[in-house]
Interface confidence: low
Amino acid sequence: KSSNEATNITPKHNMKAFLDELKAENIKKFLYNFTQIPHLAGTEQNFQLAKQIQSQWKEFGLDSVELAHYDVLLSYPNKTHPNYISIINEDGNEIFNTSLFEPPPPGYENVSDIVPPFSAFSPQGMPEGDLVYVNYARTEDFFKLERDMKINCSGKIVIARYGKVFRGNKVKNAQLAGAKGVILYSDPADYFAPGVKSYPDGWNLPGGGVQRGNILNLNGAGDPLTPGYPANEYAYRRGIAEAVGLPSIPVHPIGYYDAQKLLEKMGGSAPPDSSWRGSLKVPYNVGPGFTGNFSTQKVKMHIHSTNEVTRIYNVIGTLRGAVEPDRYVILGGHRDSWVFGGIDPQSGAAVVHEIVRSFGTLKKEGWRPRRTILFASWDAEEFGLLGSTEWAEENSRLLQERGVAYINADSSIEGNYTLRVDCTPLMYSLVHNLTKELKSPDEGFEGKSLYESWTKKSPSPEFSGMPRISKLGSGNDFEVFFQRLGIASGRARYTKNWETNKFSGYPLYHSVYETYELVEKFYDPMFKYHLTVAQVRGGMVFELANSIVLPFDCRDYAVVLRKYADKIYSISMKHPQEMKTYSVSFDSLFSAVKNFTEIASKFSERLQDFDKSNPIVLRMMNDQLMFLERAFIDPLGLPDRPFYRHVIYAPSSHNKYAGESFPGIYDALFDIESKVDPSKAWGEVKRQIYVAAFTVQAAAETLSEVA
């Protein structure tokens, strides 16, 4: 049998058949079903949903569907001892207290088990002190405070606005600045789009709405008590003092009604510039402490949350490949939510469900994919990507030998303006070709391709006539697959217009107001954007699992490697004197990139010409493509971040959500002018250039002719 016959690719069972089977109405129905009650990780409700999904995936026709459970560290508020923040007077009396819960949205007043807003993994504590406003609590914000304004945060409670960077980075920065507590709040400048009403009348954040979220700094470790290994029945667990990534100071989130009460009284220094002002009617004084008559008042935090080892459940579905069953294409997204999960994650989970149904329909008609497809419903993503990481730790040997690609499927929408894709350069051509074949759902682009509307609305900053595709960072379940294991990964969703809406994420992110009605009334009433995202995610999985030659183009990696080398070189060249003094050269890196470019070009030529009917040669060429991403993995990992092992990409050390290129070199150069031992610092830059150059050269050689 030829490969074509084995996978039964007939006109009835091609990509079009798979895509045509995807229905917006089904996604809508699944979203409704997944969002009627909360599905917090570690709760009975989320276990029941796992079993429901297992049962339905079996009905849809998958070969097997199993639950994979782990016992991981989670964090919950104390039900009888709520968390809050108060303003206290000189006598210690609480003259103002923040709210204990969000006012529930209409229709949900009688729903039980809505977890109140909290910062997951905050330690317990009741610190009191003067407040310092630290803007977004980014690295540069603390530089401004400490270096330019000479404001000392030591022993202070800091208040920071959500947005721009991952909240865990904010807490880490505050800890390093010596703060004894952190208050996080949503400023309307970031979470209230002008001209749009608050929920339930629109998609904006009301004053009582609060963003939940974890504040860990795991750096890819997974369960804080079992870094590197699965949290299984015989796991050895670290003591809590040795746990990875836990914050050391109390942290609590509030909405802008409560934030107004705290910020309104702030005295001390004026904000350094307009970028420190939000849109509340307060002066945004930095502090420390309150002004004038209020200078004797202090802020006190009351945090009583507990960390508990709790069982979580992933759902893993398998559709066995007909020709290469030992090659895995994975589609995964999480199931756990903070409350109802109207967008995060169930808009993604509903799309995965429909993709599984469509694949199952084809399978029932006798079709199989060429390669095995694994479908995953991850648990405890919101608590630090725990479900996906533990499963990957348990299955790392299989994955590193057999993993072709991972496609992530969290929230399908964060807006309804245009497509947003982050992926490995290996997938650029796949994404371009696929979106050229899909219809755009956008108004004004009737009859046009998705590629066309996407390129028009989100043009590439480098290449005319092409859409923007971003680097992978982290903050989602692809992390372990890409950053630790080196499996080619990608993600796609519909997003907002970043030019006109400069708020962070979507306003109701991680609040009680993220409901089915939010999506159905305001974001995607026809579910046409969800359908498009299903087509993109599903289409990528279909091609990756079914194309005879893997749809990876190694030449696109060559292009970006040159771009990243130019960028890091120009950063280093801001210090020409030191580069001369310490003999810092990038020649080895540029030489390796040049070699990679030439070898990738020759490999692509061979890929066009080889005999695809020879299964051994086909498998050999495909393996070279599959293992290219793996070749960028350094087994020793990045400095102080052993689970971030990809030499070309890592989550930014200053913002987990963002990707950084040549992260080892970047971090070595960061703030190098302030290092106490410049010789040692520039020595580390040289070492990182060496590691990067070696890795690029080694990766290039995997594409050379094998003998």
């Epitope: 509340l280 002066p283 945004y284």
Partner: nanobody, 126 residues
């Protein structure tokens, strides 16, 4: 809905003082900022000053700085403008404004969708 009623206006000689009051009634909970504006004949409405809910933040325009003081008594739901060393150019209709919006360009930002009083006339003349 919030109703604002200004009082205390009148005719006064240059160099003398006057105290304006603005009583707020109705749904006053959640009024975060109150302010004074004035409009002289043939001119645009001009910002005079504002005060935040607790009185901890006050802002007065440069043209009246050092002469006018803004204050607020929350127990009486009343805003005050103490005007000293009055000048002829202070002649105008003085309006009280209140905002329950938490967001704006600045904390003392007001616009037409906020609450406004009818105004009280202040004439400074010898």
């Amino acid at each position: 809905q919030v109703q604002l009623v200004e009082s205390g206006g009148g005719v006064v000689q240059p160099g003398r003082s006057l105290r304006l009051s603005c009583a707020a009634s109705g749904r006053t909970f959640g009024i975060y900022v109150m302010g004074w504006f004035r409009q002289a004949p043939g001119k645009e409405r001009e910002f005079v000053g504002a005060i935040s809910w607790s009185g901890s933040n006050r802002k007065v325009s440069d043209s009246v700085k050092g002469r006018f003081t803004i204050s607020r008594d929350n127990s009486k739901n009343t805003l005050y403008l103490q005007m000293n060393s009055l000048r002829a150019e202070d002649t105008a209709v003085y309006f009280c404004a209140a905002s329950n919006k938490l967001y704006g360009r600045t904390w003392y930002d007001f616009n037409e969708s906020d609450y406004w009083g009818q105004g009280t006339q202040v004439t400074v003349s010898s």
